[in-house]
């Protein structure tokens, strides 16, 4: 059936807590206010309607709920907590809706959400627990299978005084909830680094996007644990090099595709173990495509054409005869 | 100016009903969040009931929950509380509110109440 | 539900003189990108009026001897110099959660 629009909502309380008793029983699949339902697709959409808050009288039946486009600011704990539960809610988009505040248990109490979507919302203050809804050192599995979280990063002056990358980290590793994680993206978000323990405790990872950050090195970060690891994306960096180690472990990975475009490759003697690896590898996608930024009489030559007398360092000059 | 106007107060039973109004001029009412907050004689302010901007979301004080029915008529810039199994204790001046938002929000504007009295 | 504890219960204040009300929240009411905490001013015989915002924020039209501060669970307003218009009941309020709930109120007199 065609989307329908709901022209005066009249429903439940439905407070941020799972023991909320409605106020009055909501009509079974009635459509929110400024939302649009079809309950044949089982999806809700109340977008680009400027809410401040999530609906409170969201049919039963939804599977697929977009909430793009809104002002919601902050997610309390239990904001998708109903009675009865929101038990078939699997899909949620949340993205470009001025969220600036996740708070611990904010996806609480939706027992089927296996895809989140909190792209585009500037998380200044994204809880440790707010996917595992608890702060125990070991919280129930969630359900999540994808997470994508593309541009959260807020604008420099919003940003607390931590860590952003470790922020977000805390949020993924917390309880372990997310250890049914096969998809999550992190592109565009001035990551500077990756902390190194992220991946190992991410183990079901098929696909991770970390592309258009600032990522500089891999030295520390290990893929040795994502083995149904398929596809990393890691265009749009700041990479100068790929060391042995790292081109090892990505060589091992039985089914991964590699996306490098994009870095700012330094084609100097650092450069000839990786020049060598792309030479024999099919794991990097586009290979041919990958060109040297620096040093500046290398600039556009393309990776796969260089051999090991192109790759040379300056001597270093000692110290007696350095200029300041 | 901003104006915020209840009406509908009196003297009724227990069990009984009353349907109170809130006439909102002065601002674009359909983007304003709404409250009721009462006051019981020589008492502290108590908050009843939230409804967002567009009818979207309803929020109520677990002391009034299953009874009051919170509501709003953007066309005519009104708000509403069906008031059903009144009880002695929702004895009170009622205030109608203006917010923002529900947590990122206050009570920016009240309008100057409407008693509400609760007695056999 | 969120307690709101405010001291003192009542205060007379010479005019001219500071006045300072505290209100102290059960449970942190502060995120690292807003605190929900509010202050209103209810003067006899009318209904309450905004002071200050998210703890600190002087509402349009308040007069700037009016300060607040404070962050987690305690927080404060100030009056630099009490006015005789300044009597009434003051309640701090918070909104992080449902319910909303106020502190019990503080009466302001003056000597």
């Known amino acids: 059936s065609s989307p329908t629009s709901s022209a005066s909502s009249f429903s439940s309380s439905a407070p941020f807590l799972a023991s909320a008793v409605s106020a009055q029983p909501p009509l079974p699949d009635q459509c929110p206010a400024l939302c649009e339902c079809s309950e044949a697709a089982r999806t809700v959409k109340c977008v680009n309607r400027n809410l401040t808050e999530v609906p409170t009288d969201l049919p039963a039946y939804v599977r697929n709920l977009f909430l793009t486009g809104n002002q919601l600011a902050v997610l309390p704990a239990g904001a998708f907590a109903r009675r009865p539960p929101l038990a078939e809610l699997a899909a949620l988009n949340l993205s470009g809706s001025r969220l600036d505040e996740v708070r611990a248990g904010a996806f609480e109490h939706l027992p089927s959400l296996r895809q989140l979507d909190l792209s585009h919302n500037p998380l200044a203050d994204l809880s440790p627990f707010a996917f595992s809804g608890s702060n125990a050192s070991v919280s129930a599995p969630s359900p999540l299978v994808e997470l994508i979280l593309n541009h959260i990063v807020p604008p420099e002056d919003e940003r607390q005084n931590r860590s952003f990358e470790g922020m977000v980290v805390a949020a993924l590793l917390a309880g372990r909830a997310l250890q049914g994680l096969r998809r999550l993206e992190l592109a565009s978000n001035h990551f500077l680094y990756l902390p190194r323990d992220v991946l190992a405790q991410l183990p079901s990872l098929r696909h991770l996007d970390l592309s258009n950050n600032s990522l500089v090195s891999l030295t520390y970060v290990s893929f040795r644990n994502l083995t149904h690891l398929e596809s990393l994306h890691l265009e749009d960096n700041a990479l100068k090099v790929l060391h042995n180690g790292t081109l090892a472990e990505l060589q091992g990975l039985p089914h991964i595709r590699v996306f490098l475009d994009n870095n700012p490759w330094v084609c100097d003697c650092h450069m000839a173990d990786m020049v060598t690896w792309l030479k024999e590898t099919e794991v990097v996608q586009g290979k041919d495509r990958l060109t040297c930024a620096y040093p500046e009489k290398m600039r556009n030559r393309v990776l796969l054409e260089l051999n090991s007398a192109d790759l040379d360092c300056d001597p270093i000059l000692p110290p007696s005869l350095q200029t300041s | 100016e901003v104006q915020l106007v209840e009406s509908g107060g009196g003297l009724v039973q227990p069990g009984g009903s009353l349907r109170l109004s809130c006439a909102a001029s002065?601002?674009?009412?359909?983007?304003?969040?709404m409250h009721w907050v009462r006051q019981a004689p020589g008492k502290g302010l108590e908050w009843v009931s939230y409804?967002?901007?567009?009818?979207?979301?309803?929020y109520y004080a677990d002391t009034v929950k299953g009874r009051f029915t919170i509501s709003r008529d953007n066309a005519k810039n009104s708000l509403y509380l069906q008031m059903n199994s009144l009880r002695d204790e929702d004895t009170a001046v009622y205030y109608c509110?203006?917010?923002?938002?529900?947590?990122?929000?206050?009570?920016?504007?009240w309008g100057q109440g409407t008693t509400v009295t609760v007695s056999s | 539900d969120i307690v709101l504890t405010q001291t003192p219960l009542s205060l007379s204040v010479t005019p001219g003189q500071p006045a300072s009300i505290s209100c102290r929240a059960s449970?942190?009411?502060?995120?690292?990108?807003?605190?929900?905490l509010h202050w209103y001013l209810q003067k006899p015989g009318q209904p309450p009026q905004l002071l200050i915002k998210?703890?600190?924020n002087l509402e349009s039209g308040v007069p700037d001897r009016f300060s607040g501060s404070g962050s987690g669970t305690d927080f404060t307003l100030k009056i630099s110099r009490v006015e005789a218009e300044d009597v009434g009941v003051y309640y701090c309020?918070?909104?992080?959660?449902?319910?909303?709930?106020f502190g019990q109120g503080t009466k302001l007199e003056i000597k």
């Open positions: 002065g601002f674009t009412f359909s983007n304003f969040g």
């Open positions: 998210s703890a600190s």
């Open positions: 509110a203006r917010t923002n938002s529900l947590l990122r929000g206050f009570f920016d504007a």
């Open positions: 409804i967002s901007s567009g009818s979207t979301s309803f």
């Open positions: 309020q918070h909104s992080w959660e449902i319910p909303l709930t």
């Open positions: 449970q942190s009411v502060s995120s690292s990108s807003y605190t929900y």
